[in-house]
Structure formats: structure tokens, C-alpha cells
Interface confidence: low
């Protein structure tokens, strides 16, 4: 099984114990590590952070001791903007320039492949996204001709039904991608006006979302039925939680909220908590399991957080094994307890290790 793990370059800027550099990563934990994110400037793939090249080096030296480890560079992301991607992909010349720039950049910096994180193609971009993937793969095949190992090509896809329908020709893009990471999280957010888990495995009777599509099981099943081969589908598991501020004395699933939860001490983003911040939060909190959805949430005062723990990730891994998927994807290593100092287990990366162990279990 693949264990595809994202590392985010901006995690270096978190304060104190929240700061994470690639040299803190465990070289034997994941089969693939994806560095997020690269930029595109003047139609060429480019660095994003001022010290990206240094960080690329740190990451890729992990392969010295584990030659089986593969590293990929992810291009795009939330801050990149869908419009910029759209302009490049829809223009033949821009697309060709971008595609041509990728292999030398990856080779120079020691990466084994590219991950496309176009978040998200619009309805009119669907065909262009397919073309981009098809042409990128063709370039990788051609570039590898002189006996080099072919560069890998993957994509991170939304798990939302509406986005899947409008953005992706699943059957076609699956032919050209080496694997697909399906982002089976962020199904529920503060915009709904109620509490709800952002990454349920199944749609439990408790689910307050207005449809039957907002769960991992549905998204995976939908992708499979739209033509994604199980052997290429990698299921996303979050090492972060989504939090809410309760608006009343109700604390269950579907309770009214006044907005996102208060920012974490290190991640400093309202409505999001890293797993290591959740471990802190759990001291003195009340933990509940949403039985049908097979995930936990915790409440303390007027704060509510839905998250994944070692038990829920094991359930998710069992599920992906039952569906014969290619493996699991983790967003993100730097949101797990990467130092092993927060969650009281004396273990670095407790969630990702639980996923790894569950994948290895017979």
C-alpha cells in the first residue's frame, strides 16, 4: 500500500514547537512525501518560499538512507488561485511552456514526480485539466526515454460531489495519473451554521449535512463508479480537525454555531486545529464518538472540534483495504504530533504511524 504524506513549507513559520522543517520528517514513515507547494511564474514552475531550494535539499536527502522513498513536488494549492491555473491550462502555448519546464526543475532539485493541486478546475476547465494531465504524462514518458526513471504524475482531487461533477473527467484523467489523492476531508465547515464532522467515514444518521454525499464512503464510491481504478486511488486522512464555536448549550452533531472555533496556539487559523493542538485541547474536554460515522469529536466550554484519532484512522484504513484502494494520503505531516511531545505517547507522528501500522497489518 502507498502512504502518501504531504509536507507544507509554510509550517516552518509556526512558532516554537509548531515549526517544522523537512529534516524533522521520518524517512521510513511514508512511501511518498509530497512537498507543498510550488509556484508557476511566467508559465514556468518555480519556487514559492525564499528558502524552498534549501528545503527541497533537506527533504530529498531523506532518500539517502531510504532509497525506496519517493518525493514529489506539488504545484498550485489554495493560495495559487484557480484562475491562474485556468489561464495556463487553457492556452496551448502557456501549457506547453509550463509542461516543458517541469522535468528539468524536478530533476535539478531531486524530486521523483509532480503532484497537481489545482484547487479547483471550473466547469469550463474540465477539458483543459484533462489535456494538461495527458500532455504532462506524455512529456514525462518522452523525457524518460534515455534510460532515466520516469517521473511520477499525481493529482489531488476534491471529494465534493459537485466539484467532481464539474471539474474532473475521472475516467480519462485516471488513465494518465500514477495515483490520485482524493481529499476526503473538509466536508463540513462553519458555512453550514451547525457542528458536523469534516471527515466522516460513513454518512451516519447523525449527519446534519443537507445531502448524502458529504462523507468519505460516498466520495470513494463515486470516484470508483466514475471510472477511477481502485489501484490508483489514495484516500485522504486528515491530521487536523475542524472546530466551531457553539452558539447555545447544545453540544452534539448539528448543534448551532456562531462561527469557526478559536485559532490554535501554533496554527493560528480560526476553525482549524493541528492534531498536536487537539491533544492539548483534549485535556479537560469531553470526547464523543459519532458511531455511524466512525469518527470522534470533542467539546470544551463553547468549543467543538471534529477530528481523527488512532481509532478512526484504523477504521479508515480497514475501509480502504476492503475497497482495495492503492493506499492512504495524509494531510499533513507537520500537523501530526511530529515531535511526539504533545500527545503523551512518546511517539513521533502518532496518527501517521497508526495509519502505517494499519496498512501493514494483515
Amino acid at each position: 500500500y502507498k502512504l502518501v504524506c504531504y509536507y507544507t513549507s509554510w509550517s516552518q513559520y509556526r512558532e516554537g514547537d509548531g515549526s517544522c522543517f523537512p529534516d524533522a520528517l521520518d524517512r521510513f514513515l511514508c512511501t511518498h512525501i509530497i512537498y507543498s507547494f510550488a509556484n508557476i511564474s511566467n508559465d514556468h514552475i518555480d519556487t514559492w518560499e525564499w528558502n524552498d531550494v534549501t528545503l527541497y535539499g533537506m527533504l530529498n536527502t531523506l532518500k539517502n538512507r531510504n532509497p525506496n522513498l519517493k518525493t514529489l513536488l506539488s504545484v498550485g494549492g489554495w493560495n495559487f488561485g484557480s484562475q491562474r491555473f485556468s489561464k495556463i491550462a487553457s492556452n496551448t502555448q502557456s501549457r506547453r511552456t509550463f509542461i516543458k519546464s517541469v522535468p528539468p526543475f524536478l530533476r535539478t532539485h531531486g524530486f521523483d514526480g509532480l503532484d497537481l493541486a489545482w484547487l479547483y478546475p471550473g466547469r469550463r476547465d474540465k477539458q483543459h485539466f484533462t489535456t494538461l494531465i495527458k500532455e504532462m504524462k506524455a512529456e514525462f514518458i518522452k523525457e524518460a526515454q534515455p534510460g532515466k526513471k520516469q517521473l511520477l504524475l499525481s493529482a489531488a482531487l476534491s471529494a465534493g460531489k459537485v466539484t467532481i461533477d464539474s471539474s474532473y473527467d475521472i475516467a480519462k484523467i485516471s488513465q494518465h495519473l500514477d495515483f490520485i489523492s482524493i481529499m476526503t476531508y473538509d466536508f463540513h465547515g462553519a458555512w453550514r451554521g451547525t457542528t458536523g464532522h469534516h471527515s466522516p467515514l460513513f454518512r451516519g444518521q447523525e449527519d446534519a449535512s443537507p445531502d448524502r454525499f458529504s462523507n468519505t464512503d460516498y466520495a470513494v464510491g463515486y470516484m470508483l463508479r466514475l471510472g477511477a481504478p481502485a489501484s490508483k486511488l489514495v484516500m485522504g486522512i486528515p491530521t487536523f480537525g475542524r472546530s466551531f464555536t457553539l452558539a447555545s448549550s447544545e453540544t452534539g452533531v448539528g448543534a448551532p454555531i456562531s462561527g469557526p472555533g478559536i485559532p490554535g496556539r501554533f496554527t493560528k487559523e480560526a476553525g482549524t486545529l493541528a492534531y498536536y493542538e487537539i491533544c492539548d485541547f483534549l485535556r479537560g474536554a469531553t470526547v464523543h464518538r459519532i458511531l455511524g460515522q466512525q469518527v470522534p469529536y470533542a467539546t470544551k466550554g463553547n468549543q467543538w472540534v471534529g477530528y481523527d484519532d488512532q481509532e478512526s484512522v484504523k477504521s479508515k484504513v480497514q475501509y480502504l483495504k476492503d475497497r482495495q484502494l492503492a493506499g492512504a494520503m495524509v494531510w499533513a505531516l507537520d500537523l501530526d504530533d511530529f515531535q511526539g511531545s504533545f500527545c503523551g505517547q512518546d511517539l513521533r507522528f502518532p496518527l501517521t504511524n497508526a495509519i502505517k501500522d494499519a496498512l501493514a497489518a494483515t
Epitope: 460531489k161 467532481i164 461533477d165 460513513f202 454518512r203 451516519g204 444518521q205 449527519d207 446534519a208 449535512s209 443537507p210 445531502d211 448524502r212 454525499f213 464512503d217 460516498y218 464510491g221 463515486y222 463508479r225 466514475l226 455511524g292
Partner: antibody, heavy 123, light 110 residues
């Protein structure tokens, strides 16, 4: 391919009854949802419950049916509806029906129906 | 909870005529609406799904339209065989609903 309901009977108020839906020519795989719908004499259709045959955890009930009705997948070709504390208002023809989705993501539509089984609750 | 309201409850139409049945959802259901036909002593039959797509084997005189909260079933060139009760059904969600079906419209062909 067909489905057929069985188990309908004349029972007294307060009694319990289990109806069975049996598939022929196909099995209840992950591609299907199976639902129960009832129709009181001379009245309209009333949805009771559905189960995702591929994930038996996924059961959904009409708000009025929760607690008194239980839908279960009992084998690869049978789904049951257990009914408790029956009253005269539960007198109806009970239909079992299969969701039409060949591809997941279409709405929840029922394109394969059984002939129905009559449940009469009377003292 | 989504509530489906169907109008009229009953309608008479001459052979060859046109009949229009309306269905209103209490909140948006996108295009996830189906129409069924039911004749006495028989189970319902799926006619239209996704608001406007004809189910297999359904004649083209049946036409569905609408999205969001307002939907219409139109039967043109009505035949005697079309005498039945017609139900709309929202297929958007089965969470926290009392009934997915509308109340029904009885079509009497003269």
C-alpha cells in the same frame, strides 16, 4: 431482475411484524440502496427507510419511523423491515424498492419495485 | 425537513389533451426530482428522474422540467392508458425527512 416482499399479515394493535424483501436475478451489492415505502388504502406513498446495501451501517429513516421501524440487510439477497408497536394507522401495502443508481451520484430514485405485501392491524 | 407539495390533487383531461402537474419543494433540491406513475393495484413506476430525464421505455409525451424548488410534469397527447395517480419524489436527501414523496395527483382521462 425483481424484488418481492413477504411477511404481510393481519395482526393485533401493539404487535410486532417483520417484512422481508428478497432479490431475484441480482444481489444487494454496494451499487444499490434498498428502501421501504408504504401506502395506506386509498392514500399516497409514504417513504419509511432506506439502507445502503454496500455499507449496512448506512440506514436512514423517515423522522416518524425512527425507533419503531428497523431496516437491516440480513443476507446478500434479503433486506428486512422490523416493525414494533403496530397501530391501525400502520395498515398499508408495504413496498420494497431498489435505487436506480448504476452510477452513484444520481438522486435517490426507485426504479425496481416489488408488488407489495399487505399489513392489516386490527383487533 | 424537505416537504414536497403537489398540485392539483386531481385533474380531468380529454384524450389527446395536455395535463400539467406541479410539484414544489420547501427548499432547493437541485435537479434531484423524480416522477412516478401508479395504477390501481400496481406498484409505482419510475417515469422521470433528474427532473427531466425519461426513464427507460417511457414515451416522449411525458416531459419533466424545473430545478431548485419548482418542478412540472407535462403529459401531452394524453391517452387512456395515462389514467393513473402521479407522484413526485425528491431524491436529494433521505436525512431528516418525513416523506420523500408528494401527495399525488390523480389524472382522470375522459
Amino acid at each position: 431482475q425483481s424484488v418481492k416482499e413477504s411477511g404481510g399479515d393481519l395482526v393485533k394493535p401493539g404487535a410486532s411484524l417483520t417484512l422481508t424483501c428478497t432479490a431475484s436475478g441480482f444481489s444487494f451489492s454496494s451499487s444499490y440502496w434498498i428502501c421501504w415505502v408504504r401506502q395506506a388504502p386509498g392514500k399516497g406513498l409514504e417513504w419509511i427507510a432506506c439502507i445502503d446495501a454496500g455499507s449496512s451501517e448506512s440506514t436512514y429513516y423517515a423522522s416518524w419511523a425512527k425507533g419503531r421501524f428497523t431496516i437491516s440487510k440480513t443476507s446478500s439477497t434479503t433486506v428486512t423491515l422490523q416493525m414494533t408497536s403496530l397501530t391501525a394507522a400502520d395498515t398499508a401495502t408495504y413496498f420494497c424498492a431498489r435505487d436506480s443508481r448504476v452510477v452513484a451520484g444520481v438522486g435517490m430514485y426507485l426504479n425496481l419495485w416489488g408488488p407489495g405485501t399487505l399489513v392489516t392491524v386490527s383487533s | 425537513a424537505i416537504k414536497m407539495t403537489q398540485t392539483p390533487a386531481s385533474v380531468e383531461v380529454a384524450v389527446g389533451g395536455t395535463v400539467t402537474i406541479k410539484c414544489q419543494a420547501s427548499q432547493s433540491i437541485g435537479i434531484y426530482l423524480a416522477w412516478y406513475q401508479q395504477k390501481p393495484g400496481q406498484p409505482p413506476k419510475l417515469l422521470i428522474y433528474d427532473a427531466s430525464d425519461l426513464a427507460s421505455g417511457v414515451p416522449s409525451r411525458f416531459r419533466g422540467s424545473g430545478s431548485g424548488t419548482q418542478f412540472t410534469l407535462t403529459i401531452s397527447g394524453v391517452e387512456c392508458a395515462d389514467a393513473a395517480t402521479y407522484y413526485c419524489q425528491q431524491g436529494d436527501t433521505i436525512y431528516n425527512v418525513d416523506n420523500t414523496f408528494g401527495g399525488g395527483t390523480k389524472v382522470v382521462v375522459e
